[in-house]
């Protein structure tokens, strides 16, 4: 059984940096495996080599470790619009990103989706689109911002937050809406 993380950290701190305590013999410190490799067998005794093996294709370790298995390479999620920036190697996970003129939106810590950068039609670019942030638009007079697009004030309804920005037009909209009721 793998001991809880806290216990492993406690045990590792007994040994100097770059070494870990032997799981069966806590008087022995074994050298950790380099990135790109994993622990096949613990060192037999003090001053003896740890048996580290290179990760197989489709797996990696990105730092020195004493893991019994390499980590599986991530796959870029096509359904989220992700593209592969660099493929997985034995010492580095796959790097996923977005296409040109797109930005990443993180739904959670480990899940992002690619969306097209807003063009700010009927407005001006206040802040350019960045890797993890959409363009910030400022709308021209007679337009209001909805879902990061500049929409005509003629589409402003009483229920929307645009009423203050579209005050003169809203009065007209209200007039036509009200006149239509019986």
């Amino acid at each position: 059984l793998v001991p809880p993380l806290r216990d492993r950290e406690k045990r590792d701190s007994v040994c100097p940096q770059g070494k870990y305590i032997h799981p069966q013999n806590n008087s022995v410190c074994c050298t950790k495996c380099h990135k790109g490799t994993y622990l096949y067998n613990d060192c037999p005794g003090p001053g003896q080599d740890t048996d580290c093996r290179e990760c197989e294709s489709g797996s990696f370790t990105a730092s020195e470790n004493h893991l019994r298995h390499c980590l599986s390479c991530s796959k870029c999620r096509k359904e989220m619009g992700q593209v592969e920036i660099s493929s997985c190697t034995v010492d580095r996970d796959t790097v996923c990103g977005c296409r040109k003129n797109q930005y990443r939106y993180y739904w959670s810590e480990n899940l992002f989706q690619c969306f097209n950068c807003s063009l700010c039609l009927n407005g001006t670019v206040h802040l350019s689109c960045q890797e993890k942030q959409n363009t910030v638009c400022t709308c021209h007079a007679g337009f209001f911002l909805r879902e990061n697009e500049c929409v005509s004030c003629s589409n402003c309804k009483k229920t929307l937050e645009c009423t203050k920005l579209c005050l003169p037009q809203t009065e007209n909209v209200k007039g036509t809406e009200d006149s239509g009721t019986t």
Partner: nanobody
Framework: EVQLLESGGGLVQPGGSLRLSCAAS????????MVWVRQAPGKGLEWVSH????????FYADSVKGRFTISRDNSKNTLYLQMNSLRAEDTAVYHC????????????WGQGTLVTVSS
């Protein structure tokens, strides 16, 4: 008109199981990536899981990995969420939704079904 109707929620004890369903209509279900999101009382939306059109390689949030299973039946236009080993922190309204396309908001999502995990 896109319609998403969730069912299967209810009161369950910790450690129990529930199976949620989402009946979809008004669009080509088999072409769309489908999502389960949840909203716990007084909290924001949390992405739970999603499944691509072919059902392959679904995604799970770390908080539900190993306990929840998402699946779909394209012939029945239905999305499922099998929830096992339920915990108090899974208490929420569960919504099914179409994967957003235009931006980070849900254009189409159901009213939700309430899952309460309590002893």
């Amino acid at each position: 008109e896109v319609q998403l109707l969730e069912s299967g929620g209810g009161l369950v004890q910790p450690g129990g199981s529930l199976r949620l369903s989402c009946a979809a209509s008004g669009f080509t279900f088999a072409h769309e990536t489908m999502v389960w999101v949840r909203q716990a009382p007084g909290k924001g939306l949390e992405w739970v899981s999603h499944i691509p059109p072919d059902g392959q390689d679904p995604f799970y949030a770390d908080s539900v990995k190993g306990r929840f299973t998402i699946s779909r039946d394209n012939s029945k236009n239905t999305l499922y969420l099998q929830m096992n080993s339920l915990r108090a922190e899974d208490t929420a309204v569960y919504h099914c939704a179409l994967l957003p396309k235009r931006g980070p908001w849900f254009d189409y999502w159901g009213q939700g079904t309430l899952v309460t995990v309590s002893s």
